[in-house]
């Protein structure tokens, strides 16, 4: 029950996180004009990963896409890449985790398969979350660097007569959305990985014992039947080794994970 709850909660948390990563990636407010020096501006600038916008006091808002690819800063391209990779991995992770959910029955899928899928999706969520956090952090670092650079030469003028105020940018809402969303995806991934441990069947390592019947050299391996968890269709008896003459050394092996596929 706890495993199902952990897995379900991990899935929901990751789903919210990935939705947040998508939202952050699409948002225009990655950086917003710093109003410290001019709190009464009639023109407000803000920028996203894909376009920059200007909102006027009149209510008119104009956004322009970055139609160049080569002319964009490498850091911005890197942030875009990280966010897209995060979304793609997260989306695949969600798809995998849907089938891995303990509460969803798909044919005769065994717990071991679901455990593997849960682990896979968990890892994908963790990497997705890390990509988002990294992307947002790189952008934030870029902003901080540019902020202090523009503060250093805030005003440039001719004999102090004419002032050209340089527009400074500070953290936009998308950064906080991205950080939170990345964190949630990461937490969701960790929860999926924890759930995976509970999903994996309890395996007791018994030594294989050989029984030699006269005329037949058939080896049977105790524990050769899959332990049923009482959930799903695990009731079929599976014989690991078919009859056949084998040496004792061959037969007396520890059960490996391949024995339970």
């Amino acid at each position: 029950m706890a495993v199902t709850a952990c897995q379900g909660l991990g899935f929901v948390v990751s789903l919210i996180g990935i939705a947040g990563i998508i939202a952050a990636t699409c948002m225009d407010q990655w950086s917003t004009q710093d109003l410290y020096n001019n709190p009464v501006t009639a023109v407000f600038n803000y920028q996203g990963l894909w376009r920059s916008c200007v909102r006027e006091s009149s209510g008119f808002t104009e956004c322009r896409g970055y139609f160049t690819l080569l002319g964009l800063p490498a850091m911005l391209q890197a942030v875009r890449a990280l966010m897209i990779v995060g979304i793609v991995l997260g989306a695949i992770g969600l798809l995998v985790s849907i089938f891995a959910l303990k509460c969803i029955r798909i044919g005769s899928m065994e717990d071991s398969a679901k455990a593997n899928m849960t682990l896979t999706s968990g890892i994908m969520f963790i990497v997705s979350g890390l990509c988002a956090i990294a992307g947002v952090s790189v952008f934030a670092n870029m902003l901080v660097t540019n902020f202090w650079m523009s503060t250093a030469n805030m005003y440039t003028g001719m004999g102090g007569m004419v002032q050209t105020v340089q527009t400074r940018y500070t953290f936009g809402a998308a950064l906080f959305v991205g950080w939170v969303a990345g964190g949630l995806t990461l937490i969701g991934g960790v929860m999926m990985c924890i759930a995976c441990r509970g999903l994996a069947p309890e395996e007791t390592n018994y030594k294989a014992v050989s029984y030699h019947a006269s005329g037949h050299s058939v080896a049977y391996k105790p524990g050769g039947f899959k332990a049923s968890t009482g959930f799903g269709s695990n009731t079929k008896n599976k014989k690991i080794y078919d009859g056949g003459a084998r040496t004792e050394d061959e037969v007396q092996s520890y059960p490996s994970k391949h024995d339970y596929v």
């Epitope: 501006t41 009639a42 006027e56 006091s57 009149s58 209510g59 008119f60 002032q163």
Partner: antibody
Framework: EVQLLESGGGLVQPGGSLRLSCAAS????????MSWVRQAPGKGLEWVAT????????YYADSVKGRFTISRDNSKNTLYLQMNSLRAEDTAVYYC???????????WGQGTLVTVSS | DIVMTQSPDSLAVSLGERVTMNCKSS????????????LSWYQQKPGQPPKLLFY???TRESGVPDRFSGSGSGTDFTLTISSVQAEDVAVYYC?????????FGQGTKLEIK
């Protein structure tokens, strides 16, 4: 047709109060930022105050800050300017204007004259 | 506050002549976000409210004759009338639309000789 009609002007004593109204028609009033601009007799134009679309932000000229209050009633399509502690230098024709692209004022009312005199 | 200074204060020209008036701001009106200059030009004829001619320094308002043109960037702006007509007699104002308080120039009065 866009129309802005100011009213409420008149003669008032120094220290007195007056409330100007601007009735808007011919456009979606609630979707526009509105301003008041004044012009003293024989002088140039002076921006007085601006109220943003939702009414949440208001801006004032230093000369009227603390004395004048701009407000709007979107349900009545009306812009207001409450003027308190009036001074002789507030004597002017007050225009109601609509802001558009570039924060420019594309439509102006005919104006209402406010005279502050004892 | 941004100070707007217009020159000349007044000018008298003959009909059909080309006229140029200037407007200078104490701070740049160029917005880096969209590379637009937040300056507008108005025409005020005697006994009338002002009329918008240009916004974003050079974007002509609909209904404004094409003999009028606006130019300039940063801190220096110009309003040009290629061929002055009798109906162009008015006072012309430039305005800072970039930051509050919105400020107007003192105006340039255009007269016919």
């Amino acid at each position: 047709e866009v129309q802005l009609l100011e009213s409420g002007g008149g003669l008032v004593q120094p220290g007195g109060s007056l409330r100007l109204s601007c009735a808007a028609s011919g456009f979606t009033f609630s979707s526009y930022t509105m301003s008041w601009v004044r012009q003293a007799p024989g002088k140039g134009l002076e921006w007085v105050a601006t109220i943003i679309i939702g009414g949440s932000y208001t801006y004032y000229a230093d000369s009227v800050k603390g004395r004048f209050t701009i407000s709007r009633d979107n349900s009545k399509n009306t812009l207001y300017l409450q003027m308190n502690s009036l001074r002789a230098e507030d004597t002017a024709v007050y225009y109601c204007t609509r802001l558009v692209k570039g924060n420019a004022m594309d439509y102006w009312g005919q104006g209402t004259l406010v005279t502050v005199s004892s | 506050d941004i100070v707007m200074t217009q020159s000349p204060d007044s000018l008298a020209v003959s009909l059909g002549e080309r006229v140029t008036m200037n407007c200078k701001s104490s701070q740049s009106l160029l917005n880096s976000g969209n590379q637009k200059n937040y300056l507008s030009w108005y025409q005020q004829k005697p006994g009338q409210p002002p009329k918008l001619l240009f916004y974003w320094a050079s974007t002509r308002e609909s209904g404004v004759p094409d003999r009028f043109s606006g130019s300039g960037s940063g801190t220096d702006f110009t309003l040009t009338i290629s061929s002055v007509q009798a109906e162009d007699v008015a006072v012309y104002y430039c305005q800072n639309d970039y930051s509050y308080p919105f400020t107007f120039g003192q105006g340039t009065k255009l007269e016919i000789k």
